[in-house]
Every structure is written in C-alpha cells, then in structure tokens.
C-alpha cells in the first residue's frame, strides 16, 4: 500500500485526514476519561483540546458508555490484569493484529482496540511509565491509519459508530466486543 496521499483530502467525514484527526481526538478523550475515573492524572495527554462539536461529543459519549460496560466484564478485566507490561510493544502488536486477523472489520473491534490501548495506558500510569502513554497512542493511531482507515472510509466515517452502537441492543454488541478482546488476549497468553 502506498500511503502518500492519494486518499481524498479536505474536511469531508471520509477523508483520511479527518478520520485520523477524529480518531486521535476520540482516543485521547477516551483515555483521559478512563484515567480521570481512576483518579489518575495524565498531563502527557493534554496535547490538543478535544473539540466540542456535537458529532464528536456524541461519539465520545458512545465510547464512554461502552467503556463503562467493558469495565464491568470481570473475565476481560482478569485477562487485562495479567498482561505483562514489560514488553508492551509485543503485546500491543500481537493482540491488535489478532483482533483483525480474520479480515473481518466492525465497529466493535475498533472500540476493542481503543479500549485495549486505554488499559495499557492506565497500566503505564500505574507503573509510573508516563513516556509509554504517547507511544501507545502512537501505536494505536498507526494501526488505525494502516489497517482500519480504508474500512472506516467505507462506513462513511466515524458516524457509522453511532448507528452501530445506537441500537437498543448495544449491550449485546458490547458483550461481543469483550469476547473479541478476551479471545485475542487468550491467544496472546498461549503464544507468550
């Protein structure tokens, strides 16, 4: 793939740049929110202010809601707690790759990627490795750019997330998200 800028430019919701900008803001806001709930402060994340436009607000609220639901999944939390942060690069790349290894893309998996990144960041904060925070965000955004960007464009941009999780059965979808991430972590544990 040659990513030298053939994709549409400008401010449209499906332009590469807009999807990445929104993705970065959503990821940053999601991580800040989860860190805040833990009572942790992450000044390293205060780079660009998260915009307050209605669309991004809705997306952020949707992500928060899913994050809260995933937080209550005890099996998933046990798996994440067992992640060895001595080799975060290896863990991140293996788990992220495994989540999408079957070539099937859906918003649940995109959210699972964000959630996993946020948990790695929180582990980094707890273990006093603040320089790892930007790095994990960088890995996540690179993964988004390289593996998920085309698919998000095909969904009409980030607003597709709202329709995916905006149904009465969103809790069911969240259970599926937890399952995807748990399965990937299980595979990683076996390989590790």
């Amino acid at each position: 793939m040659d990513g030298s800028g053939e994709q549409p430019r400008g401010g449209g919701p499906t332009s590469s740049e807009q999807i990445m900008k929104t993705g970065a803001l959503l990821l940053q806001g999601f991580i800040q929110d989860r860190a805040g709930r833990m009572g942790g402060e992450a000044p390293e994340l205060a780079l660009d202010p998260v915009p307050q436009d209605a669309s991004t607000k809705k997306l952020s609220e949707c992500l928060k809601r899913i994050g809260d639901e995933l937080d209550s999944n005890m099996e998933l939390q046990r798996m994440i707690a067992a992640v060895d942060t001595d080799s975060p690069r290896e863990v991140f790349f293996r788990v992220a790759a495994d989540m999408f290894s079957d070539g099937n893309f859906n918003w649940g998996r995109v959210v699972a990627l964000f959630y996993f990144a946020s948990k790695l960041v929180l582990k980094a904060l707890c273990t006093k490795v603040p320089e790892l925070i930007r790095t994990i965000m960088g890995w996540t955004l690179d993964f988004l750019r390289e593996r998920l960007l085309g698919w998000i464009q095909d969904q009409g941009g980030w607003d597709g997330l709202l329709s995916y999780f905006g149904t009465p059965t969103w809790q069911t979808v969240t259970i599926f998200v937890a399952g995807v991430l748990t399965a990937s972590l299980t595979i990683w544990k076996k390989m590790g």
Partner: antibody
C-alpha cells in the same frame, strides 16, 4: 546495542541502478518503520521512502515514486532501497533511520531515533 | 505537501547564549514534529520528538515547544559542542518533510 549500517552506495551512470542495504541489529525491524532519508551535497535533508513490514506497507516521496522500491527481509533484519533510472539529482548521502510510531496522520511522533552512518550515491557520466 | 519554514537559516552566537530556532508548518501538523542536530559528515541526531519531548540522553538545555503551527527549539545555554545545523521535521501528513535547516555558528 541498536545499530543501522548502510551499504551499496557508489558511482553510477545516469539511467543506471543501485541497491542500498540497511542492516539492523539490536532490534527487530518488523516492529518499526524503516525510513530512507537523503542529503545532497551541501543541502538539507529529504525524506525518500519508508516501510513497515508489520503492516506490509510502503511509502514514497513523489520525486522517487516509480523509480525506487523499498523492501525488507525480516529474516535478515535488513531493509533495502532499489534505485532504478537514476538521475544526477539523486546524488546524495543516503541514510536509513527507524521510527517507532507516527508515520502520517498521527498526532504524536517518536521521531527518527537511530540513524545509520550514511552511504554516498553519485550519479554522473 | 506541508512546508516547514525554518528560521533563521543561520545564526552566530557565543557560548552561554540562549538560542531560539523556529519552524512554521504551512498547515496543522498536531504535535508530530521532531528536531534534529547534524554535524558535518555525520548522521542527524534526534533531540526532540512530539514537539516537546526530550529524547533520552539529550542534555536538558535543549527544549521544544509548540504554539499552533509554530514550533520552537531552544538551547538555554549554548555549549561548544552545540555548534551544528538543526532541522525540524513533521510526520503528520505524507510526505514527511523537513525544514531547510539552521546553521548555528560561533560568533
């Protein structure tokens, strides 16, 4: 110890070809972006190409697209730059460098933290 | 392509001086900017990444800051080994682009 060592430079006639190698040690290239950056005599730095073997993706500057090909052999932990249809303006010292994250559209960048010593490519008749 | 306009192109300073080099991006590059030092015949060395993060092993007299699309490299107290050429670089949008360089010479 992390190290990058370039080789393969030399004198070549316009229209000719060269293959540069960048042998890495102390880290696994599959986890990083490897970039080629060049510097013409007395001039500034110009990004040429990059590769991520993890994502199987390659990127090129417009000035070399269609003429240069970047590749990597993870078993040898080595990246390559195949340069065809060389022109006088390709004369430069070619460096390889690694990047942990932040190729493009990423709001954070680790920067090019390790560089090779460079190899000189001279295109002249 | 994003232009990284670096200024000044050269400057003369004395040991102990405070030196400031600026780089202006032609459009938003978020914080995806790095600064490098290069000495004649040598490869560039990373000083600052993500606009303001000091790379490990780099002396604390070097610092980076960002204000919108303006980026600044500051050397708080110039040392003899700091006389070199400095480059900014953005990696937010393809293609990656460098500033034209600032040569810091002895006054």
């Amino acid at each position: 110890e992390v190290q990058l060592v370039e080789s393969g430079g030399g004198l070549v006639q316009p229209g000719g070809s060269l293959r540069l190698s960048c042998a890495a040690s102390g880290f696994n290239i599959s986890s990083y972006y490897i970039h080629w950056v060049r510097q013409a005599p007395g001039k500034g730095l110009e990004w040429v190409a990059s590769i991520s073997s993890y994502y199987s993706s390659t990127y090129y500057a417009d000035s070399v697209k269609g003429r240069f090909t970047i590749s990597a052999d993870t078993s040898k932990n080595t990246a390559y730059l195949q340069m065809n249809s060389l022109r006088a303006e390709d004369t430069a010292v070619y460096y390889c460098a690694r990047v942990s994250y932040g190729h493009a559209y990423v709001g954070y960048s680790s920067g090019m933290d390790y560089w090779g010593q460079g190899t000189l490519v001279t295109v002249s008749s | 392509d994003i232009q990284m306009t670096q200024s000044p192109s050269s400057l003369s300073a004395s040991v102990g001086d405070r030196v400031t080099i600026t780089c202006r991006a032609s459009q938003s590059v978020s914080s995806a900017v790095a600064w490098y030092q290069q000495k004649p015949g040598k490869a560039p060395k990373l000083l600052i990444y993500s606009a303001s993060s000091l790379y490990s092993g780099v002396p604390s007299r070097f610092s980076g800051s960002r204000s919108g699309t303006d980026f600044t490299l500051t050397i708080s107290s110039l040392q003899p080994e700091d006389f070199a050429t400095y480059y900014c670089q953005q990696s937010y949008v393809s293609p990656i682009t460098f500033g034209q360089g600032t040569k810091v010479e002895i006054k």
